[in-house]
């Protein structure tokens, strides 16, 4: 058993069919010695008496808010949560496996630039009695500070018969050094509590590996006189690191016909303009990637040819 | 470069960009193979990193690019020695068309651009001997290449910025 925060305790349960459970001794936080009784959750029924209460925790019903009382007055509370391990593996029932970029990916994180700011998100089908808390640092043995904001419900989607909820959090490295080569990874730790179930999820990454620029902005087409060709131009996204002479992007451009089956020629360029043949009903698209490190491509920015 | 002269920024830019391409073609499987394990915080200390105080940021380069260039050169020589060691030359043998050979030559080429003949900067010691098991060697190759990708990305940014803003 360990303390998650004041008056909240996590009982680690190594579960197998005939597991004996965990013996937990609760102590009433009071100088009083006599006339103390214990209750569980909202029930008025007395579970036991005395300054300590010993319980055998074997299933979720044994967890909950234990309160000690004297003369009808609550003296102290202890909320017991269960963290379940089965076959040597901690439970991951609360969050959905996003399976990208690999199996057992419960947290996904992205950064728009090298400023040390990043966003992580996760999915669940649970809609109520759910709380999250997030901690982050750079490195684990001698951690450097990362500050995370409040967790927010960022999206709701219907997936077949189920509703899926996306939660996200924004974090910022306290002393980011955008130009340096990262040596220690960022660690993100999410605590999830659903009813009386406690779970924790972690992710470890370098900012450079989670970079995904915003799409290029200001796409413009300028027809060239007496030609089927057009000059297309675009700009770095506002959110990308500066100066651009240092934090450079490379671009992938394509012209997509109306039919999805039509062959698309992709061209790669470091410039922010190109000359292409842009037929009527087609569209021109461009996406960006860090020029020197193969992290994710941005989403496409598109503009119709006509 | 030693003694304060300027490097051939444009040449360095071209070669460092080529290094980035080669480093990724040598080990493209980036997001799909998590090579970080327990204790990696210690093993990453073995390779030289371009750190915050090394003056490789745009402001540091404007003030005095020498600190940064020295750091980059140390790293290039370190990786050049690693790629020439039996970590890469031993079993399992690299494929004949492996980009590691080109990568090795380009590391050497760029380090020489930063130090013309006759000047010798001290460089870091080559790391401890290579592991004996082929599978360990393979894993170490991947780790070295991942680390090299990060190192040459910073070097390439430095030379791109230098070529754009510091060239005479």
């Amino acid at each position: 058993i360990w303390e998650l925060k004041k008056d909240v305790y996590v009982v680690e349960l190594d579960w197998y069919p005939d597991a004996p459970g965990e013996m937990v001794v609760l102590t009433c936080d009071t100088p009083e010695e006599d006339g103390i009784t214990w209750t569980l959750d909202q029930s008025g029924e007395v579970l036991g008496s005395g300054k300590t209460l010993t319980i055998q925790v074997k299933e979720f019903g044994d967890a909950g808010q234990y309160t000690c009382h004297k003369g009808g007055e609550a003296l102290s509370h202890s909320l017991l949560l269960l963290h379940k391990k089965e076959d040597g593996i901690w439970s991951t029932d609360v969050l959905k496996d996003q399976k990208e970029p690999k199996n057992k990916t419960f947290l996904r994180c992205e950064a728009k630039n090298y400023s040390g700011r990043f966003t992580c998100w996760w999915l669940t089908t649970i809609s109520t009695d759910l709380t999250f808390s997030v901690k982050s640092s750079r490195g684990s043995s001698n951690p450097q500070g990362v500050t995370c904001g409040a967790v927010t419900l960022s999206a709701e989607r219907v997936r077949g018969d189920n509703k899926e909820y996306e939660y996200s959090v924004e974090c910022q490295e306290d002393s980011a050094c955008p130009a340096a080569e990262e040596r220690l990874p960022i660690e993100v730790m999410v605590d999830a509590i659903h009813k009386l179930k406690y779970e924790n999820y972690t992710s470890s990454f370098f900012i450079r590996d989670i970079i995904k620029p915003d799409p290029p902005k200001n796409l413009q087409l300028k027809p060239l006189k007496n030609s089927r060709q057009v000059e297309v131009s675009w700009e770095y996204p506002d959110t990308w690191s500066t100066p651009h002479s240092y934090f450079s992007l490379t671009f992938c451009i394509q012209v997509q016909g109306k039919s999805k089956r039509e062959k698309k020629d992709r061209i790669f360029t470091d410039k922010t303009s190109a000359t292409v043949i842009c037929r009527k009903n087609a569209s021109f698209s461009v996406q960006a990637q860090d020029r020197y490190y193969s992290s994710s491509w941005s989403e496409w920015a598109s503009v119709p040819c006509s | 470069v030693p003694g304060g002269s300027s490097p051939a920024w444009a040449q360095c830019q071209q070669l460092s960009q080529k290094l980035c391409t080669l480093a990724w073609s040598a080990h493209p499987l980036v997001g799909h193979m998590d090579l970080r394990e327990e204790g990696d915080e210690e093993t990453t200390n073995d390779v030289p990193h371009i750190q915050c105080g090394d003056g490789c940021d745009p402001q540091g380069l404007r003030d005095n690019s020498q600190f940064c260039l020295q750091r980059i050169r140390q790293g290039l020589i370190f990786y050049e020695k690693l790629l020439g060691s039996d970590i890469f030359t031993g079993e399992p043998s690299l494929l004949p068309d492996s980009p590691v050979g080109q990568l090795h030559a380009s590391l050497l080429g760029l380090s020489q651009l930063l130090q013309p003949e006759g000047h010798h900067w001290e460089t870091q010691q080559i790391p401890s001997p290579s592991p004996s098991q082929p599978w360990q060697r393979l894993l170490l190759r991947f780790k070295i290449l991942r680390s090299l990708q990060a190192f040459v990305a910073v070097a390439a940014r430095v030379f791109a910025h230098g070529a754009a803003t510091l060239s005479p």
Partner: nanobody, 126 residues
Framework: EVQLVESGGGLVQAGGSLRLSCASS????????RGWFRQAPGKEREFVAA??????TYSDSVKGRFTISRDIAKNTVFLQMNSLKSEDTAVYYC?????????????????????WGQGTQVTVSS
């Protein structure tokens, strides 16, 4: 994925006693409460008793006569029935709830339970 098996039913004379057992297997860690319900012919299934950790609750009709208890080590719940009456004749069902209610009285509702046993017949002859 929780299995429940009742035993201990039978024929008993009015005023007599019986002890019912309910053995649970499968993913028993997910259980918040266990209960006993009964169904007499032509009647609705009704609540008898429930237990969660050390908490117990009973229907008014059995209070003081029936006792629900739990053997933690054996994953078994018991219903000790004393002073049996002919109106106690019914099929007795064991149930397990994997939903959490902070108000323990919610476990006296039939729809709070997710898993049910096959039932055991109790007949009280007068």
């Amino acid at each position: 994925e929780v299995q429940l098996v009742e035993s201990g039913g039978g024929l008993v004379q009015a005023g007599g006693s019986l002890r019912l057992s309910c053995a649970s297997s499968g993913r028993t860690f997910s259980i918040y409460a266990r209960g006993w319900f009964r169904q007499a012919p032509g009647k609705e299934r009704e609540f008898v008793a429930a237990i969660r950790s050390g908490l117990t609750t009973y229907s008014d009709s059995v209070k003081g006569r029936f006792t629900i208890s739990r053997d933690i080590a054996k994953n078994t719940v018991f219903l000790q029935m004393n002073s049996l009456k002919s109106e106690d004749t019914a099929v007795y069902y064991c149930a397990a709830a994997v939903n959490y209610f902070t108000d323990f009285t919610d476990y006296s509702k039939r729809d709070s339970y997710d898993y049910w046993g096959q039932g055991t017949q109790v007949t009280v002859s007068s």
